[in-house]
């Protein structure tokens, strides 16, 4: 059918609560495109009727709520004027009883469900709520070990729980709860978060400095091999992660099938005041779909990108 297949990472979700996934693949979805969702390679698209428990809402697929039997591979097909991309998303649904300690922990926790607070600093946790505009999210409540969090050190601000003067006792199991309203019906969203404490300066300490790249484009011929370094300076005691991402996904996950684009092994040089880190991204073969796409180097809260660009035609050759 001429569609290029892209495989996204697995999403592990909790049953009996709302879930939504947005089909975005910049720069493809930034232009005039149509997006259609399917389940398990079915030829019949997911319903667009808003009363349906599972339906498409603009570019999103929305489950109100998610149920045990909804596990499977979902495809969203993005059709542009001259292109077609099929994105595969593997959704795994599990039963999780946040306050039942007899039931094991979460399988394969993603970063959204594992968060860090920095000892002795003012820091915050985030309640990740990704839903389309049609979903109105109500007040958020925070719990620790199943008790609602109260006290001077804690402030619920938007989707965050601000924690002042973090102490070792702040580690543990948290949950954030929000009420979601859609078409007059109310649903409860409950996200569990495992919080660990670090003594080292990270977020809230110094900000890593990305020396290269500098948010620029690189001219590169189609089909060539390309290696780009991300050079970062940071404090010696930092806990920041450095990585390359595309479409907000680690490149190694994004290109998991083809392994055409890979992140290299990080190296560092130690100076008296700081460390200089280098982590590269390798394009084994530059393809057409790589052009115009921001490849982001992340270092803690700092980001910088490169965009591949076709070289301008050399008219001297004609």
């Amino acid at each position: 059918d001429g569609c290029k297949d892209i495989f996204m990472k697995n999403e592990i979700l909790s049953a009996s609560q709302p879930f939504a996934f947005n089909c975005t693949f910049p720069p493809i979805t930034s232009g005039e495109v149509s997006v259609t969702w399917y389940k398990n390679s079915s030829k019949i698209p997911v319903s667009k009727i808003i009363q349906s428990r599972i339906h498409q809402d603009e570019t999103w697929i929305l489950f109100l709520p998610m149920e045990w039997g909804d596990s499977g591979v979902y495809q969203c097909v993005i059709k542009g004027r001259d292109s077609c991309h099929r994105i595969h998303v593997n959704l795994t649904v599990f039963e999780k009883h946040w306050c039942d300690t007899s039931i094991g922990g979460l399988p394969n926790l993603s970063d959204e469900y594992k968060q860090i607070l920095h000892l002795g600093k003012d820091d915050s946790l985030t309640c990740h709520l990704h839903f389309p505009k049609s979903c109105v999210l109500g007040p958020i409540k925070w719990y620790k070990d199943c008790n609602e969090i109260k006290g001077e050190r804690f402030t619920v601000l938007e989707t965050r729980l601000l924690v002042s003067n973090v102490s070792a006792e702040d580690r543990g199991n948290y949950a954030c709860q929000a009420i979601l309203t859609h078409s007059g019906k109310q649903y409860e969203v409950l996200n569990g978060i495992t919080v660990s404490i670090t003594e080292r300066a990270g977020y809230g300490g110094s900000v890593p400095k990305i020396i290269y790249p500098k948010n620029h484009s690189i001219e590169v011929q189609l089909g060539t091999t390309l290696i780009v370094d991300c050079n970062v300076t940071d404090t010696k005691d930092n806990t920041n992660l450095r990585c390359w991402r595309v479409n907000n996904t680690l490149v190694d996950d994004y290109y998991d099938e083809s392994k055409r684009i890979r992140e290299g092994v990080e190296t560092h040089v130690s100076f008296r005041e700081h460390n200089l880190y280098t982590v590269n991204i390798t394009f084994l073969e530059v393809k057409m779909e790589d052009y115009g796409l921001p490849f982001m180097c992340h270092a803690g809260v700092s980001t910088a990108y490169i965009i591949l660009q076709l070289p301008a035609p050399d008219f001297r050759a004609y």
């Epitope: 999210l137 965050r160 601000l162 900000v207």
Partner: antibody, heavy 120, light 112 residues
């Protein structure tokens, strides 16, 4: 639609207190922080603090922690901000403000402002 | 406290011409959750302030699309593609990454 209506202008003597009210309508009063921001003549905007009607939770700018009290009357959906030990530099327009939504910050809704003049 | 520093202090613009205001924060406002807790407001004489941009680059409801916000974790820019007479006032940047919430000193925009 969301509306915040504040009490009228006040003239006070140094050392006195002033209590400014902010009556909310068009939304669930107990779901949102009410923020207070002031602007003194020829000065910028200054955040004084915020008050949550559920549980009477107050978070103050340290600059005002000894002089500001925030309270509410749930029956009339009104929040009050009292500033004590007034001095001439407290002459300002005082605004109450509410965020865009419960999950998106930024003050999308503002009261019309209350001018407080401190003069002997 | 996070300090917000705005430049320039004032700006005189010809109608129809572009304008740009800068703001720098003393700490990165880009959170681990990928949200940048940065805002732009316009305060017109005799009115309460008006939210223009939220979370660095999102246009607030009812704000004309001639306004746009961009930036990094610490350096931010508000651009007006074509200034109109109604755009006069004092522009403020603000952060709500952490308490206390803080504002920049303001940039006064007037029409030539």
């Amino acid at each position: 639609q969301v509306q915040l209506v504040q009490s009228g202008a006040e003239v006070k003597k140094p050392g006195a207190s002033v209590k400014v009210s902010c009556k909310a309508s068009g939304y669930t009063f107990t779901n949102y922080w009410m923020n207070w921001v002031r602007q003194a003549p020829r000065q910028g905007l200054e955040w004084m603090g915020m008050f949550h009607p559920t549980g009477d939770v107050t978070r103050l700018n340290q600059k005002f922690k000894d002089r500001v009290t925030m309270t509410r009357d749930t029956s009339t959906s009104t929040v009050y901000m009292e500033l004590s030990s007034l001095r001439s530099e407290d002459t300002a327009v005082y605004y109450c403000a509410r965020t865009t939504s419960m999950i998106i910050g930024g003050f999308a809704y503002w009261g019309q402002g209350t001018l407080v003049t401190v003069s002997s | 406290d996070i300090v917000m520093t705005q430049t320039p202090l004032s700006l005189s613009v010809t109608p129809g011409q572009p304008a740009s205001i800068s703001c720098r924060s003393s700490k990165s406002l880009l959170h681990r959750n990928a949200i940048t807790y940065f805002y732009w407001y316009l305060h017109k004489p005799g009115q309460p302030p008006q939210l223009l941009i939220y979370q660095m680059s999102n246009l607030a409801s009812g704000v004309p699309d001639r306004f746009s916000g961009s930036g990094s974790g610490t350096d931010f820019t508000l651009k007006i593609s074509r200034v109109e007479a109604e755009d006069v006032g004092v522009y403020y940047c603000a952060q709500n990454l952490e308490l206390p919430l803080t504002f920049g000193g303001g940039t006064k925009v007037e029409i030539k």
